[in-house]
């Protein structure tokens, strides 16, 4: 091991204060006691250290806690957190939501980094599930957080946590993720009345099956086109013209503008043209009158 340079006379740090910003890296290494640093971590954030000086301070903490920092230190890391690697964070045991919030606050506005992803992963795994308070915190800092999880990870979200989800939190979710979230939302909101239920469930409908869409069509919900366009194509195809008309209410006129896009395009191809004509929207591409429609998928299932 390289012999350590001695601290120059009169430079030994008695406390963590602003005089340390004028220390060279080797002086910080030689003159700052790691135990003192650990007990005064809350002061570091107030002092304008350079990134290189922070590296020295981090090195001192690493030497003091080779198995990982205690939560009392982690909670006060402040912007020193930005210096941590995923490998460092995997050694931590973060159990307090306050600690998580403090570290996410430091990272606020930054891109979601591997460090933050690791921190969140460690925290959630430690809790065993993504509870409402945690989800509330994470989506407040990262609106896209929920949609960054795999369907398998989403399966650990309890229905009670769904109350913390805002529509914008689901903006980037794909159908596979909504398939997992929708049944949980249905369960979470099941005791709400019709119109209130629809307001809450609307963002999750990209995971709804046909039978639930049929049920909604009987409730005068007036689904907007943006929501309709996010529905699963396979769930929309079996809906009749009358059901779609009831589902959309006054928004049905918007189908014309979307007739070339999925799922509207595929749905039109499955409808009888004379049924489409009843909408009076000029939708074209339905099955001509007099044609017999064979559902080949049903035929295969029977044979």
């Amino acid at each position: 091991e390289v012999e350590k340079t001695a601290c120059p006379s009169g430079k030994k740090a008695r406390e963590i204060d602003e005089s340390l910003i004028f220390y060279k890296k080797w002086e910080l290494e030689a003159c700052v006691d790691a135990a003192l640093l650990a007990t005064q971590m809350d002061r570091v954030n107030a002092i304008p250290f350079t990134y290189e000086q922070l590296d020295v301070l981090k090195h001192k903490l690493d030497e003091l806690y080779p198995q990982g920092y205690p939560e009392s230190v982690i909670q006060h890391l402040g912007y020193l957190f930005l210096k941590m690697s995923p490998e460092d964070i995997r050694k931590w045991n973060v159990t307090s939501l306050e600690t998580l919030k403090a570290l996410l606050e430091v990272n606020k506005g930054h891109e979601m980094s591997p460090q933050v992803a690791t921190l969140i992963d460690r925290f959630v795994k430690g809790r065993g599930q993504l509870d409402k308070d945690t989800l509330d915190t994470l989506t407040a800092f990262y609106p896209g957080y929920l949609c960054s999880l795999s369907p398998e990870e989403l399966s650990s979200v309890p229905p009670s946590s769904i109350w913390a989800v805002r529509p914008q939190d689901l903006d980037t979710c794909d159908p596979r993720q909504l398939d997992v979230l929708y049944p949980k939302a249905r369960l979470a909101f099941q005791n709400m009345n019709g119109s209130e239920y629809f307001v809450k469930i609307q963002s999750f409908l990209g995971g709804a099956p046909t039978e639930d869409l049929k049920a909604l069509s009987q409730q005068n919900v007036s689904m907007d086109l943006a929501t309709f366009m996010k529905l699963r194509t396979d769930a929309v195809l079996p809906l009749t013209v009358a059901e779609v008309q009831k589902l959309l209410g006054p928004h049905v006129e918007g189908l014309k503008a979307e007739e070339r896009h999925r799922p509207v395009r595929d749905w039109i191809l499955r409808q009888r043209q004379d049924d489409l004509d009843t909408l009076g929207l000029g939708l074209q591409g339905g099955i001509p009158n007099g044609y017999l429609v064979l559902d080949l998928s049903m035929q295969e299932a029977l044979s």
């Epitope: 304008p48 990134y51 930005l82 591997p114 460090q115």
Partner: antibody, heavy 117, light 107 residues
Framework: QVQLVESGGGLVKPGGSLRLSCAAS????????MTWIRQAPGKCLEWLSY????????YYADSVKGRFTISRDNAKNSLFLQMNSLRAEDTAVYYC??????????WGQGTLVTVSS | DIQMTQSPSSVSASVGDRVTITCRAS??????LAWYQQKPGKAPKLLIY???GLQSGVPSRFSGSGSGTDFTLTISSLQPEDFATYYC?????????FGCGTKVEIK
């Protein structure tokens, strides 16, 4: 001695794109955080974005978030700023600088970006 | 965002004069403050960091002081090469923000 040299500026139409580069020399580039700052004609300096030494930590000012992308190539001692969906108000001299956390200790000479139809 | 307000926006002075420029932060920033000098057509140059630390190679006639919200840059004896625009910058939080400058002109 430390040197930072920007390039890639020029005239571009609104909605267009440009990629700025900053070539670094005279120091160990991979050890330092880097930043982009701009100055519109007769206006204040505006900090835009920074990237950590490894490239894993990035931050953007709201004015450019979603349109600009900062990146670096440590093997080539280079910093980049990809600018998309450019607007007239993005017209400025763009500087790269070495970021020390509490201050920017070295700056390039700047490259002029003009967004006009 | 933290707003940085410089005053005055310009000052006329003669060689040998003592010049003081102030910078106020909209909220406390401890000593997370730097000062830069910029000459026309040139990049800014770091003078002071940490509110009072003199950057290597910068003449000792430049000094900085202050903490919290109020900061001062002082040029003890103005030299011909000091006529320029001076900017303060906070680094306490993101986004980093600059003052809009104080122009030091020849009287």
């Amino acid at each position: 001695q430390v040197q930072l040299v920007e390039s890639g500026g020029g005239l571009v139409k609104p909605g267009g794109s440009l990629r700025l580069s900053c070539a670094a020399s005279g120091f160990t580039f991979s050890d330092y955080y880097m930043t982009w700052i701009r100055q519109a004609p007769g206006k204040c300096l505006e900090w835009l974005s920074y990237i950590s030494s490894s490239g894993s930590t990035i931050y953007y000012a709201d004015s450019v978030k979603g349109r600009f992308t900062i990146s670096r190539d440590n093997a080539k001692n280079s910093l980049f700023l990809q600018m998309n969906s450019l607007r007239a108000e993005d017209t400025a001299v763009y500087y790269c600088a070495r970021d020390r956390n509490s201050h920017f200790d070295y700056w390039g000479q700047g490259t002029l970006v003009t967004v006009s139809s | 965002d933290i707003q940085m307000t410089q005053s005055p926006s310009s000052v006329s002075a003669s060689v040998g004069d003592r010049v003081t420029i102030t910078c106020r932060a909209s909220q406390g920033i401890n000593t997370w403050l730097a000062w830069y000098q910029q000459k026309p057509g040139k990049a800014p140059k770091l003078l002071i960091y940490g509110a009072s630390g003199l950057q290597s190679g910068v003449p000792s006639r430049f000094s900085g002081s202050g903490s919290g919200t109020d900061f001062t840059l002082t040029i003890s004896s103005l030299q011909p090469e000091d006529f320029a625009t001076y900017y303060c910058q906070q680094a306490k939080s993101f986004p980093r923000t600059f003052g809009c400058g104080t122009k030091v002109e020849i009287k």
